[in-house]
Interface confidence: medium
């Protein structure tokens, strides 16, 4: 086509020179200057932004580093030049959050949109009498869904930042040391008491190691949504149920529904936000599996969803089974990747934390050496991984998981059957040809699924250049909910895997990630990396990035692209 656009019945004011013409000559630019058409300097026409658009709504967002808009309406803005805007206001009465599209050439609430070109919505305070008023604008799809009040790295001078860190670090060392000692002593005491109360799966390790490793596990505790750690990993056997008020339905799975809920604090008005997974009476087995997995205190890890308690509830709908866990406002990884393009740092963080979570699940010991029952997830996929506020992953949905108890016989393992989601099933699972003599083979199927998730993350990383809309693995090959047979055709017959375009490999960090995930989806389960090895590779990437002092450069990694890790 190219200049051929000028042919036909095109009205003069939408005549466009495309990329073949490289840039639009000034006289043509004037002729296309109506407000429905916006072009970049290469002559491409901008599609209007996708923005959250709920106008003004009451909000609970207060005193947080960032908030989700909780707006369920995504609109294509009317005009291509419009950007996404969020306005947060607080007065004596209430807090509101406004989400709209707006033209940055025009003031909004009497303020100019100074940050319209930013891909993130970073709130800036504006002076308004009688209220606290914050506003942000941004220009990437649905960027006003996640509003940020404090950007972690907001200094433009990294050297200055380093100096600040060094000075404050040195001056804070003595009081920090004292504080950490006090915390460790307190935790050891608390955990010691908890240890006496709970009967955990133990082997003959010394008490000393148990005490040391327990405080170690607690130091690793995640940045929980806002849950007091005191009630973590308990089963609520009491007849008195927790004071929970269900809020909104946030997810629906095969076996259960997940609600955002308020956990009331004593008699005060205060509450903590939690997630409640509600299983109907018929899905008791699934609830019990997940409850039993969560009950193991050694499962506790920053990259595994934090569990509070399990309850049996009688309602007018009959008996229900509840699991109460931490709530993560960013939602699951699939939703997050659908809404957001991620940076190289985000990819490294998400990938690394995912691998660490799976490695911990698979491990037969805690990070501090305490014995632990290895577990396989068996349904790893992007919708079963939650994104925490610090942009790390945590695993959830253990309804199909299996504890690799050394007492299980081959028959027991064989009876566990072909489980999981067809799209993410490893070739040997699709074929029902697993080596049941070796429990490691179960872990290898998790690693295959993890590789597909790492590919999903990479496909949405802007370090690769072209970022397409989110697609699940094999998105263009199979329908939305593929059956085992169609996956067999793709994965077994055609030996198909998601495509890794050559331009992804221009970024050396991404190249390493691609090499890693390719080794993880190998047809031969024995040839796949372990989750621990993948975690180590991500650590090495982080180390290499830190050495280079730059975050996005393609020169960060040694030319030979070597990473010294073993399987």
């Amino acid at each position: 086509m190219g200049r051929g656009l000028l042919r036909g019945l095109w009205p003069l004011h939408i005549v466009l020179w495309t990329r073949i013409a490289s840039t639009i000559p000034p006289h043509v630019q004037k002729s296309v200057n109506n407000d429905m058409i916006v072009t970049d300097n290469n002559g491409a026409v901008k599609f209007p932004q996708l923005c959250k658009f709920c106008d003004v709504r009451f909000s609970t967002c207060d005193n947080q580093k960032s908030c989700m808009s909780n707006c369920s309406i995504t609109s294509i803005c009317e005009k291509p030049q419009e950007v996404c805007v969020a306005v947060w206001r607080k007065n004596d009465e209430n807090i509101t959050l406004e989400t709209v599209c707006h033209d940055p050439k025009l003031p909004y609430h009497d303020f100019i949109l100074e940050d319209a070109a930013s891909p993130k919505c970073i709130m800036k305070e504006k002076k308004k009498p009688g209220e606290t008023f914050f506003m942000c604008s941004c220009s990437s799809d649905e960027c006003n869904d996640n509003i940020i009040f404090s950007e972690e790295y907001n200094t433009s001078n990294p050297d200055l930042l380093l100096v600040i860190f060094q000075v404050t670090g040195i001056s804070l060392l003595p009081p920090l040391g004292v504080a950490i000692s006090v915390i460790i002593i307190f935790y050891c005491y608390r955990v010691n008491r908890q240890q006496k109360l709970s009967s955990t799966w133990e082997t003959g390790k010394t008490r000393k190691l148990m005490e040391f490793s327990e405080h170690c596990a607690i130091i690793l505790e995640d940045d929980r949504s806002d849950i007091s750690s005191t009630c973590a990993n308990n089963i609520n056997h009491n007849t008195e149920l927790l004071p929970i008020e269900l809020d909104t339905l946030v997810g629906k799975g095969r076996f259960a529904e997940v609600y955002k809920a308020k956990l009331k604090q004593n008699t005060s008005e205060q509450f903590e936000t939690v997630a409640v997974k509600i299983f109907p009476y018929e899905e008791y087995a699934s609830w019990k599996t997940e409850k039993d997995i969560f009950s193991d205190i050694n499962l506790k890890h920053e990259n595994i969803l934090q569990f509070l308690t399990a309850e049996e509830r009688k309602t007018e709908l009959g008996k229900q089974y509840w699991l109460i866990t931490a709530f993560h406002a960013k939602g699951n990884l699939q939703e997050y990747l659908t809404r957001h393009v991620i940076s190289w740092e985000d990819l490294r963080k998400l990938g690394s934390s995912l691998a660490r979570g799976i490695a911990h699940l698979h491990s037969d010991h805690t990070p501090c050496g305490r014995p632990k029952m290895p577990i396989v997830h068996r349904d790893l996929k992007s919708s079963n991984i939650l994104v925490k506020n610090d942009l790390t992953c945590c695993l959830c949905d253990f309804g199909l998981s299996l504890r690799l108890d050394p007492t299980l016989s081959v028959d027991d393992l064989a009876n566990s059957g072909q489980v999981g989601t067809a799209r993410y099933m490893a070739p040997e699972v699709l074929e029902s040809r697993m080596n049941l003599e070796n429990v490691e083979s179960f872990k290898q199927t998790d690693v295959y699924s993890m590789a597909l998730v790492l590919w999903e993350m990479t496909s949405r990383c802007n370090a690769v250049g072209e970022v397409k809309d989110y697609e699940p693995p094999f998105g263009s090959k199979v329908r939305e909910h593929p059956c085992v047979e169609s996956m067999k055709d793709n994965v077994l017959r055609d030996r198909g895997r998601p495509e890794i375009p050559s331009f992804w490999l221009n970024h050396q960090g991404i190249q390493m990630v691609c090499e890693t995930l390719t080794e993880c989806w190998d047809h031969d389960p024995e040839a796949r990396l372990t989750a621990q090895c993948v975690a180590e590779r991500f650590s090495e990437l982080e180390h290499l990035d830190r050495l280079s002092g730059r975050s996005c450069s393609e020169e960060k990694i040694p030319e030979d692209g070597s990473l010294n890790t073993t399987k």
């Epitope: 990329r19 970049d40 901008k46 393009v341 072209e466 809309d469 697609e471």
Partner: nanobody
Framework: EVQLLESGGGLVQPGGSLRLSCAAS????????MAWARQAPGKGLEWVSR????????YYADSVKGRFTISRDNSKNTLYLQMNSLRAEDTAVYYC??????????????WGQGTLVTVSS
């Protein structure tokens, strides 16, 4: 050479249906997001809908939500727009467009010549 050729337009009564097609050639169709836009007589260009490269994600303008459905057949290199419950205000020239890439923003660099849809009793 990139080519986009729309077809399927015509005269239809209010409440009626039409299916527009856009045949693409000159590029790897399955690699690119596609979109439909329209221009009513004497008005500016209005975006109608957008679809991801494999058809997994779709987006619609509020004015057509629930009535129009965008789809694609990558094996036939064809983009579709199924238009139901048509109204007089849907009268316009409908264009199909191919997305280019800049990492974050959605920009469309190639356009068809358009097909005219007239909704009138």
């Amino acid at each position: 050479e990139v080519q986009l050729l729309e077809s399927g337009g015509g005269l239809v009564q209010p409440g009626g249906s039409l299916r527009l097609s856009c045949a693409a050639s000159g590029f790897t169709f399955s690699d690119y997001d596609m979109a439909w836009a329209r221009q009513a007589p004497g008005k500016g260009l209005e975006w109608v809908s957008r679809i991801s490269h494999s058809g997994y994600s779709t987006y619609y303008a509020d004015s057509v939500k629930g009535r129009f459905t965008i789809s694609r057949d990558n094996s036939k290199n064809t983009l579709y727009l199924q238009m139901n419950s048509l109204r007089a205000e849907d009268t316009a020239v409908y264009y199909c467009a191919k997305r280019s890439w800049d990492g974050v923003h959605a920009q469309f660099d190639y356009w068809g010549q358009g097909t005219l849809v007239t909704v009138s009793s």
